[in-house]
Amino acid sequence: MMTGTIETTGNISAKKGGSVILQCHLSSTMAQVTQVNWEQHDHSLLAIRNAELGWHIYPAFKDRVAPGPGLGLTLQSLTMNDTGEYFCTYHTYPDGTYRGRIFLEVLESSVAEHSARFQIP
């Protein structure tokens, strides 16, 4: 039975040209996390963190995506096109798959609100 829950940073905003951390946390389960996938709003894969093989960043995003902290993902040099949904998918054993959603809004620098708990200044 899947007892765990995914906590995420929820709805966050960040400045155009800035950076932001996307973070999910799996709690309330003893399941072993075998892999975490990070996907963009169009379901294209940004990165994978495999417990045994480490990180792999999709080549198209290599210059703007940094692994971590932890199982999270740092997006850099944000553009307005980065606005949208992001998903973390946790593959676990023996529970199965958990999925979390984050909505990122990229704002023009002049109107950006520092609402992201994990935002980098």
């Epitope: 075998t34 892999q35 894969l45 495999n50 417990a51 093989l53 480490g54 792999h56 960043i57 290599k62």
Partner: antibody, heavy 117, light 107 residues
């Protein structure tokens, strides 16, 4: 187009070290992707050996971890395999390959290495 | 280690036939499976990744399916250039492992 080419000695004596070079053209090994070594044994069995990432991190097959080292020379766009304490069991065709999410989308032509005294 | 069991080990088929190769995996790997073709004296070539996505330039007569622990590669209307050895490979943990191969020969 990215191309990979293996090179190195075709004959190695038992207990010595096997050293191979993979020359990559058409793509910088520090730009992205992972860069792997895989071998094909005479019985047509494929074994993944390990990789070095574009950032220089290495991951090895646990069965080889005590004997293997993968390094790179970014100025020459080469990456290397060193396998220590070889035996006749290490006789194989050795391939270098480019990895994307740990599958292999571009392979070299392969180089045959025989371990024999 | 994750074990990959391919079947059959070999098969004989004629041009125009449809053939199916299966790969059974010892652990649940979601869709993290690739298929390769290797012709005599050549290096392996990626055919399919993520269990069912065709690699660039691969003809549409090839198709992959399955998830979890059971996967298959289907070749519709076998062509002369399709004869060779086919391998499955998981990309879900260390070590990455391959199946023992299926040799597709001309009947």
């Amino acid at each position: 187009d990215v191309q990979l080419q293996e090179s190195g000695p075709g004959l190695v004596k038992p207990s010595q070290s096997l050293s191979l070079t993979c020359t990559v053209t058409g793509y910088s090994i520090t730009s992205a992707y992972d860069w792997h070594w895989i071998r094909l044994f005479p019985g047509h069995i494929l074994e993944w050996m390990g990789y070095i990432s574009y950032s220089g991190n290495t991951i090895y097959n646990p069965s080889l971890k005590s004997r293997i080292s993968i390094t790179h020379d970014t100025s020459k766009n080469h990456f290397f395999l060193k396998l220590n304490s070889v035996t006749t069991e290490d006789t194989a065709t050795y391939y270098c390959a480019r990895g994307s999410f740990w599958y292999f989308d571009v392979w070299g032509a392969g180089t045959t290495v025989t371990v024999s005294s | 280690d994750i074990q990959m069991t391919q079947s059959p080990a070999s098969l004989s088929a004629s041009v125009g036939e449809t053939v199916t190769i299966t790969c059974r995996v010892s652990e649940h790997i979601y869709n993290y499976l690739a298929w390769y073709q290797q012709k005599q004296g050549k290096s392996p070539q990626l055919l399919v990744y993520n269990a069912k996505t065709l690699a660039e330039g691969v003809p549409s007569r090839f198709s992959g399916s399955g998830s979890g622990t059971q996967f298959s590669l289907k070749i519709n209307s076998l062509q002369p250039e399709d004869f060779g050895t086919y391998y499955c490979q998981h990309n879900y943990g260390n070590p990455l492992t391959f199946g023992a191969g299926t040799k597709v020969e001309l009947k």
